[in-house]
Amino acid sequence: SSPTSSASSFSSSAPFLASAVSAQPPLPDQCPALCECSEAARTVKCVNRNLTEVPTDLPAYVRNLFLTGNQLAVLPAGAFARRPPLAELAALNLSGSRLDEVRAGAFEHLPSLRQLDLSHNPLADLSPFAFSGSNASVSAPSPLVELILNHIVPPEDERQNRSFEGMVVAALLAGRALQGLRRLELASNHFLYLPRDVLAQLPSLRHLDLSNNSLVSLTYVSFRNLTHLESLHLEDNALKVLHNGTLAELQGLPHIRVFLDNNPWVCDCHMADMVTWLKETEVVQGKDRLTCAYPEKMRNRVLLELNSADLDCDPILPPSLQTS
């Protein structure tokens, strides 16, 4: 059936907190005002409507909910809690809705939620318990399989006096709730580093997107536990070289494809191991496109075409011979 739109102001209140319950039970197939609903597709779209809250009268059949392009600002605890619960909701897209605050337990009472997209929201305040729902050391497992967090970094002047990377990682690791996560996208977040413990605690990952960040090094990151990892996107970062430990770990992952385009590779003596590895490995996609950025004399040289004689380091002069 084609999407239907309802402008009904039927008063069904099934709000985000236990203290506010339905005034009267919502009709099972009712479509909220300003939304489009297709019961056949189990889909509700409330898109670009400047909503400041999640609609209260969502139909019980909803499996795919699009709330993109709104002005939600804050997701409180139980923002999607309803009586009866939205038991079928599997995919929730909140991208581009001006969210800057996601509180503990915001996605509680969504037992089937497998895909969550919070991309393009300036998340200055992401609770450590946003996805786990509780501050217990071990929480009930989250049903989430895909978590899309691309471009959630707030503008510099809105960031709190803490590490943005740390805030995001705390939410990913809290209560070990995301052990079943298979896809994690963290592109375009100005990440300078990847905290060393994050990947070890997400053992089910198949797809990890860290593209378009500012990662300089993977020295302290371990991929060893990610035995199911199929794709690793590291394009458009600030990587200078991959060292032996990282190369060996990547080579040891049975299903992996790695994407390394558009990094400022430094083609000096420290690059020799990586060049040797690139020539032998099948895991790097588009490896023939990787080029040197530094030093100047090596700029735009293709990594695969380099040999050990090309990769030299300027000798470090002893202090007594250095000039100011």
Epitope: P15, N50, L51, T52, E53, V74, P76, E101
Partner: antibody, heavy 120, light 111 residues
Framework: EVQLVESGGGLVQPGGSLRLSCAAS????????MHWVRQAPGKGLEWVSY????????YYADTVKGRFTISRDNAKNSLYLQMNSLRDEDTAVYYC?????????????WGQGTTVTVSS | DIVLTQTPLSLSVTPGQPASISCRAS??????????LHWYLQKPGQPPQLLIK???NLESGVPDRFSGSGSGTDFTLKISRVEAEDVGVYYC?????????FGQGTKLEIK
């Protein structure tokens, strides 16, 4: 000038019904969420209900849940509160108030109020 | 529900003197993004009017002798020099969650 004018109050017996109205002018009504807030005689302020700008969200205080229904007609710049099964403790001045959002908002404009008296 | 407790419940102030009202919340009503606490004045026989939004932001048209401060659970409304027109009942209100609640009110009188 922002104006909110409540009407529909009066004397009603316990168990009876009333419908309050709030007429808005001086601003784009459809861009704002609206609240009802009440004040019992000699008492403080009590939030009653909220409706979002496009009637997608409705919230109620526990004390009125299941008895009161909030609604709005953006074409008529009007807010309503249908009050059923009225009780003595519902006696109060009822104010309508404007907000830009529920949690990130505040009551930035108020009507003069309409008095509801529930008594046998 | 979040309980807001105001102190004192009444105060009598000489014109030109300062006044201070406290509002304490039963749980934090601040995040790092926003403070969900607002102040109102209800003058005798009138509806309430917004004075301070988000703890410290003066509403347009409100005299700058009014100021607000605080975060978390403890908030303060200050009047630097009380004037006769400031009499009435002052309320704090949170918007952290449903239900929205008000403090019980503080009655300001002029000596």
């Amino acid at each position: 000038e922002v104006q909110l004018v409540e009407s529909g109050g009066g004397l009603v017996q316990p168990g009876g019904s009333l419908r309050l109205s709030c007429a808005a002018s001086g601003f784009t009504f459809s861009n704002f969420g609206m609240h009802w807030v009440r004040q019992a005689p000699g008492k403080g302020l009590e939030w009653v209900s909220y409706i979002s700008s496009g009637s997608t969200s409705f919230y109620y205080a526990d004390t009125v849940k299941g008895r009161f229904t909030i609604s709005r007609d953006n074409a008529k710049n009007s807010l309503y509160l249908q009050m059923n099964s009225l009780r003595d403790e519902d006696t109060a001045v009822y104010y309508c108030s404007r907000t830009n959002s529920l949690l990130r908002g505040f009551f930035d404009a108020w009507g003069q109020g309409t008095t509801v008296t529930v008594s046998s | 529900d979040i309980v807001l407790t105001q102190t004192p419940l009444s105060l009598s102030v000489t014109p030109g003197q300062p006044a201070s009202i406290s509002c304490r919340a039963s749980q934090s009503v601040s995040s790092s993004s926003y403070t969900y606490l607002h102040w109102y004045l209800q003058k005798p026989g009138q509806p309430p009017q917004l004075l301070i939004k988000s703890a410290s932001n003066l509403e347009s048209g409100v005299p700058d002798r009014f100021s607000g401060s605080g975060s978390g659970t403890d908030f303060t409304l200050k009047i630097s020099r009380v004037e006769a027109e400031d009499v009435g009942v002052y309320y704090c209100q949170h918007s952290w969650e449903i239900p929205l609640t008000f403090g019980q009110g503080t009655k300001l009188e002029i000596k």
